[in-house]
């Protein structure tokens, strides 16, 4: 079993997440991604990608919004209008099928405050520290999605259960996501 | 001190390869995506792609797929970049660059770093 | 592709001028642009990212705004040591692109 780090990501109401998940491209170009939320022990797709295409558009399902990018081997993730009750432990995974995913990675702990959600003016920057709380750098208030690229919306999915084979990470047990350290 | 030591100038022929080396010091190599920029005699910045050190994860910009190949070595914190089937349109700066993120999976693509640049002339 | 209309592409102004780039995106970007300092024979330096903050170390003169498609530079009171290239740079997709660049110069 690995270990899986946590990243811990601190934001006040009205902000918008955006993660970058990566892959290997040999192995997962084509297939559906998703972003998932732990309940519990257990994991809850909130969105995913569609079948793989040429063309691949944003997808979105609510304040969530999914890209992928195949050729770089990316998958872009945006969750506007934070609210307090967002807080929680996500995800993203390659989405085999409902009752098996592949996790990409480190688990994001998301916790979203009340408060001033303005872009704090802050100069504090140190470079060495990628597991700083994004002070300097917290994204733009409310919904940011209004490209006019066609978006596909999606509704939510039920819940799955996690088991990750393979050279991504290894999970013997879903709740070895719930016990993992954590970077402040 | 944080720096990025790319390798000399070279001079190729038409349809051989090229490969610059980056080696990162003053960070933990691992923590921090690198990336390939190039600027052309006179021209603007180009973005050529990325690779995660720390899993060998890479992304290449449509234009160079088939001919980038970006690799590294984490014993000796050094990131590579070669260039196939090298054309004249070729000649150019190539930059390496760290992408500085608040945390490592942040969709930020701030290069706060640079290294000084690799000239690579291609000419017959 | 996002593609970066930056302008204008040259400019000379004199010291204490006051002196503003922009760049226009072919699409909404959503803030996350940078903007960087390229002096001749140098490695691009950033100044501004996400838009409108300062890098750690930039002087307060340089600035950013801006949002959806539509962005600025500005560098409040120009000083001899500004005399570069200025590119800004968008990754609200990809791949990530540049700006054709505006060369500054001094009267």
């Known amino acids: 079993t690995t270990e899986l780090t946590e990243e811990k990501y601190e934001y006040k109401e009205g902000q918008t997440l955006e993660v970058k998940c990566d892959y290997a491209l040999e192995k997962y170009a084509n297939s559906r991604k998703a972003w998932q939320k732990m309940e519990g022990k257990m994991p809850k797709i909130l969105a995913k990608t569609e079948r793989p295409s040429e063309n691949s558009h944003p997808v979105q399902v609510g304040r969530i919004t999914l890209e992928d990018y195949p050729d770089h081997g990316l998958l872009q993730v945006r969750m506007t209008n934070l609210q307090v009750e967002d807080s929680g432990l996500y995800q993203c995974v390659i989405y085999q099928h409902p009752k098996e995913s592949h996790v990409l990675f480190n688990p994001i702990c998301l916790v979203v405050t009340k408060g001033s959600s303005g872009t704090p003016g802050s100069s504090e920057n140190s470079t060495q520290n990628v597991y700083r709380t994004p002070s300097t750098t917290a994204k733009a208030l409310g919904p940011r999605y209004t490209s006019p690229r066609t978006v596909t919306q999606a509704p939510p999915e039920s819940t799955v259960v996690v088991s990750t084979p393979g050279s991504e990470i290894n999970l013997t047990n879903v709740t070895d996501i719930i016990r993992v350290p954590v970077f402040n | 001190q944080v720096q990025l030591v790319q390798s000399g100038a070279e001079v190729k022929k038409p349809g051989a390869s090229v490969k610059v080396s980056c080696k990162a010091s003053g960070y933990t190599f691992t923590s921090y995506d690198i990336n390939w920029v190039r600027q052309a005699t006179g021209q603007g910045l180009e973005w050529m792609g990325w690779m995660n050190p720390n899993r060998g994860n890479t992304g290449y910009v449509k234009k160079f797929q088939g001919r980038v190949t970006m690799t590294r070595d984490t014993s000796i914190s050094t990131a590579y970049m070669e260039l196939s089937s090298l054309r004249s349109e070729d000649t150019a700066v190539y930059y390496c660059?760290?992408?500085?993120?608040?945390?490592?999976?942040?969709?930020?693509?701030?290069?706060?770093?640079w290294g000084r640049g690799t000239l690579v002339t291609v000419s017959s | 592709d996002t593609q970066m209309t930056q302008s204008p592409s040259s400019l000379s102004a004199s010291e204490g001028d006051r002196v503003t780039i922009t760049c226009q995106a072919s699409q909404d970007i959503f803030n996350d642009l940078n903007w960087y300092q390229e002096k001749p024979g140098k490695a691009p330096k950033l100044l501004i990212y996400?838009?409108?903050n300062l890098e750690t170390g930039v002087p307060s003169r340089f600035s950013g705004s801006g949002s959806g498609t539509d962005y600025t530079f500005t560098i409040s009171s120009l000083q001899p040591e500004d005399i570069a290239t200025y590119y800004c740079q968008q990754y609200g997709n990809l791949p990530l692109t540049f700006g054709g660049g505006t060369k500054v110069e001094i009267k």
């Open positions: 660059a760290r992408r500085r993120a608040v945390y490592r999976s942040s969709w930020e693509w701030y290069f706060d770093l």
């Open positions: 996400h838009a409108s």
